[in-house]
């Protein structure tokens, strides 16, 4: 008789999840000499241990502590790029501007990027059928708790000038309910962070508005200022050209406006 399985509203664990995590770990530690000491089998065991046999709506940050310990990594604290609702451009940027880092440029962020996972209470099975949706089911699910944990730690590590890329095409350029708005903003350390600099990425080709005057940006400025951190805001009017010119400043198209 097939065992009854909880049906969640979200997609199930990513196909070949264990193999993917292990392969990503091996690849990352090969590319990053400072992480060569990491034992990827232990990393996978710690990752698995955080959610296997546990109710997928009852995961805590504590569950991920063994993984956090194994994935401890030092990135230059003054070279951190946060992002909200504009992941692809942020990643393209750090691929070019190699001395800046998003969370997904760290081992733990790299391992989990774009993956979904969950287990089942009291069985060692991974649930490939469905996993809890943050809104429809529960917020304390394995994926959400993981990102909340690593995002908090990443923000806590930041110092000096912290940059954040925001999507100027969205109705809420700054969204208090995003991971950036609900976790990272509140975990920047005022004694270490001097300035948060927002880069608002424009979507429209002819959009010359100063989106730094947007009410949600003013809200972000207010939150940040109350935390005794200075705030600065920049418009990136032509993101495609911006990336191209960061990559190759001598390019003839970069001698005109971007």
């Amino acid at each position: 008789v097939p065992r009854w399985r909880q049906q969640w509203s979200g997609p199930g664990t990513t196909k070949r999840f264990p193999e993917t995590v292990l392969a990503r770990c091996v690849k990352y530690t090969e590319i990053h000499p400072e992480m060569r000491h990491v034992d990827c089998q232990s990393v996978w065991d710690a990752f698995k241990g955080a959610f296997i046999s546990k109710h997928p709506c009852n995961i805590t940050e504590e569950d991920y502590q063994p993984l956090m310990k194994l994935g401890t990594q030092t990135v230059p604290c003054n070279k951190i790029l946060l992002w909200s609702r504009i992941k692809d451009l942020a990643h393209q940027f750090t691929q070019v501007q190699r001395d800046m880092f998003t969370l997904e440029d760290t081992l733990l962020g790299y391992l989990a990027d774009d993956l979904t996972w969950c287990g089942e209470f009291n069985t060692s099975k991974i649930n490939y059928q469905s996993c809890p949706d943050w809104r429809k089911d529960c917020s304390n699910n394995p994926v959400s708790v993981f990102w909340k944990t690593v995002s908090r730690r990443f923000a806590e590590a930041a110092c000096d000038v912290v940059h954040v890329m925001l999507n100027g095409s969205r109705s809420k350029i700054f969204d208090k309910n995003s991971t950036f708005g609900s976790v990272e903003v509140h975990n920047l350390q005022p004694e270490k962070v001097q300035t948060l600099e927002a880069w608002v990425i424009h979507g429209g080709r002819e959009d010359s508005r100063d989106l730094c005057q947007d009410p949600t940006i003013k809200e972000l400025e207010s939150i940040i200022s109350k935390r005794n951190i200075q705030f600065s805001c920049k418009n990136i009017y032509r993101p495609d050209k911006f990336l191209q010119c960061v990559k190759n400043p001598e390019d003839s198209s970069c001698t005109s406006e971007i």
């Epitope: 003054n78 070279k79 501007q97 001395d99 800046m100 000096d160 000038v161 940059h163 001097q194 010359s208 100063d210 730094c212 600065s232 805001c233 920049k234 418009n235 990136i236 009017y237 911006f242 010119c245 960061v246 400043p249 970069c254 001698t255 005109s256 406006e257 971007i258």
Partner: nanobody
């Protein structure tokens, strides 16, 4: 820390030259336009010159065009203003600033800038 520090001001005779420097230290990424403004006693700051992020595009106020030259060295994190053929009416406090964008779209407006350095005084005697 992000700091814009203007230096190079001083006392010079009319017809003489000065080179102002603005160091934009504490920056990981220097991909934004920058500008020079000046302020006469009791007046608003006024636009002098601006340069885009790569140094390939510049803009000058009519009053300094042909006499002043703006440039930047992103490796040294420094912007310059070479001031030739100085006149007594150039006497002012000069400020450097970083713009809100990479290009020069709103570079003549004070609101187009969000980081300001401390000023350096230029006095031109007749």
């Amino acid at each position: 820390d992000v700091q814009l520090q203007a230096s190079g001001g001083g006392l010079v005779q009319a017809g003489g030259s000065l080179r102002l420097s603005c160091e934009f230290s504490g920056r990981t990424f220097s991909g934004f336009a920058m500008g020079w403004f000046r302020q006469f006693p009791g007046k608003e700051r006024e636009f002098v010159a601006a340069i885009n992020w790569s140094g390939s595009s510049v803009d000058y106020s009519d009053s300094v065009k042909g006499r002043f030259t703006i440039s930047r060295d992103n490796v040294k994190s420094t912007m310059y203003l070479v001031m030739n053929s100085l006149k007594p009416e150039d006497t002012a406090v000069y400020y450097c600033a970083e713009a809100r964008s990479a290009e020069l779209g709103s570079s003549r407006k004070i609101q187009g800038y969000d980081q300001w350095g401390r000023g350096t005084r230029v006095t031109v005697s007749s």
